[in-house]
Interface confidence: low
């Protein structure tokens, strides 16, 4: 089989209580029940992975507790949203995408969604 | 500079138990899954087992082949990897590997450094 | 669990020659790995997800395939390339790796 294909926006800008939010859709070769989606961050050559979920079809996705991202399902497409961005976050954000049940197994990266994040200016002092 | 080293290992008799360890440096131990593989003398590679990574969790996964009697886990705080093995057996005796899985492109699950090895005998 | 199959188990190559090594796997998976190995050193990551070579290693390495049917080619032998190369695969959750090729020089 030929590796899936995942797509996603190329640029997405967080707003300015640092959430931001992309599709990610892959074209499923078969009828998966059984998807885990991850979220990769790539800023100077160095690749982190920021959440992951593993969800059954017509699921919820359900993240770690702590995680900052969350997410919902929609046939073959994943709504995420990462939170808690700060300017420093800035960077390529990849979907991952794995058909885990039933066989055969696929995966599928995406060219990534580069998320940029501007830290909001400080409020002015005021005596009002 | 990556490094992982394994330590550990040693003759130990049938039905014995023995641990081995990772230590590991160079690289932020709670962001990478973490496999074990070993090689009998003068045969092929065999993975054996991986600990995810924080993200997902820190949970295991394990090969047929010594699912039930080996265990991995991981120390965070000194970023060092273990396996546990229990009631071992002669075909158990190899060189064992520690090796790191690595997430970015274009290495997904690929095993992209890897300890030196450490020899383990199951001999009476 | 997932088969891979390496042929040749032995080969051997003057310096020149192009070589080309298989593996095979019993279902279908969506990427190969290769790893070589040279007497009492670790693996080290030769080619990553099925064509994309590691770090240093020289461009007469090539990886190709899809499916079932996957290959390392070498396409002009060196006496450094003499080692053993071990594909791996990744599915569900679990490692495989072939049984290897082990390539010699003439």
């Known amino acids: 089989c030929k590796a899936m294909h995942v797509a996603q926006p190329a640029v997405v800008l967080a707003s300015s209580r640092g959430i931001a939010s992309f599709v990610c859709e892959y074209a499923s070769p078969g009828k998966a029940t059984e998807v885990r989606v991850t979220v990769l961050r790539q800023a100077d050559s160095q690749v982190t992975e920021v959440c992951a979920a593993t969800y059954m079809m017509g699921n919820e996705l359900t993240f770690l507790d702590d995680s900052i991202c969350t997410g919902t399902s929609s046939g073959n497409q994943v709504n995420l949203t990462i939170q808690g961005l700060r300017a420093m976050d800035t960077g390529l954000y990849i979907c991952k995408v794995e058909l885990m049940y039933p066989p055969p197994y696929y995966l599928g990266i995406g060219n990534g969604t580069q998320i940029y994040v501007i830290d909001p200016e400080p409020c002015p002092d005021s005596d009002f | 500079e990556v490094k992982l080293v394994e330590s550990g290992g040693g003759l130990v008799q049938p039905g014995g138990s023995l641990r081995l360890s990772c230590a590991t440096s160079g690289f932020t131990f709670t962001d990478y899954y973490m496999s074990w593989v070993r090689q009998p003398p003068g045969k092929a590679l065999e993975w054996l087992g991986f600990i995810r990574n924080k993200a997902n969790g820190f949970t295991a996964e394990y090969s047929a082949s010594v699912k039930g009697r080996f265990t991995i886990s991981r120390d965070n705080s000194q970023s060092i990897l273990y396996l546990q093995m229990n009631t071992l057996r002669a075909e158990d005796s190899a060189t064992y590997y520690c090796?790191?899985?690595?997430?970015?492109?274009?290495?997904?699950?690929?095993?992209?450094?890897w300890g030196q090895g450490t020899s383990v005998t199951v001999s009476s | 669990q997932i088969v891979l199959t390496q042929s040749p188990a032995l080969m051997s190559a003057s310096p020149g020659e192009k070589v080309t090594m298989t593996c095979s796997a019993s279902?279908?998976?969506?990427?190969m790995y290769w790893y070589q190995q040279k007497p009492r050193s670790s693996p080290k990551p030769w080619i990553y997800?099925?064509?994309n070579l590691a770090s240093g290693v020289p461009v007469r390495f090539s990886g190709s395939g899809s499916g079932t049917s996957y290959s390392l080619t070498i396409s002009s032998m060196e006496a450094e390339d003499a080692a053993t190369y071990y594909c791996?695969?990744?599915?569900?959750?679990?490692?495989?790796f072939g049984s290897g090729t082990k390539l010699e020089i003439k």
């Open positions: 090796a790191r899985d690595s997430l970015a492109y274009p290495h997904y699950y690929a095993m992209d450094y």
């Open positions: 997800l099925t064509s």
């Open positions: 279902s279908s998976v969506s990427y």
């Open positions: 791996q695969q990744w599915s569900s959750n679990s490692f495989t």
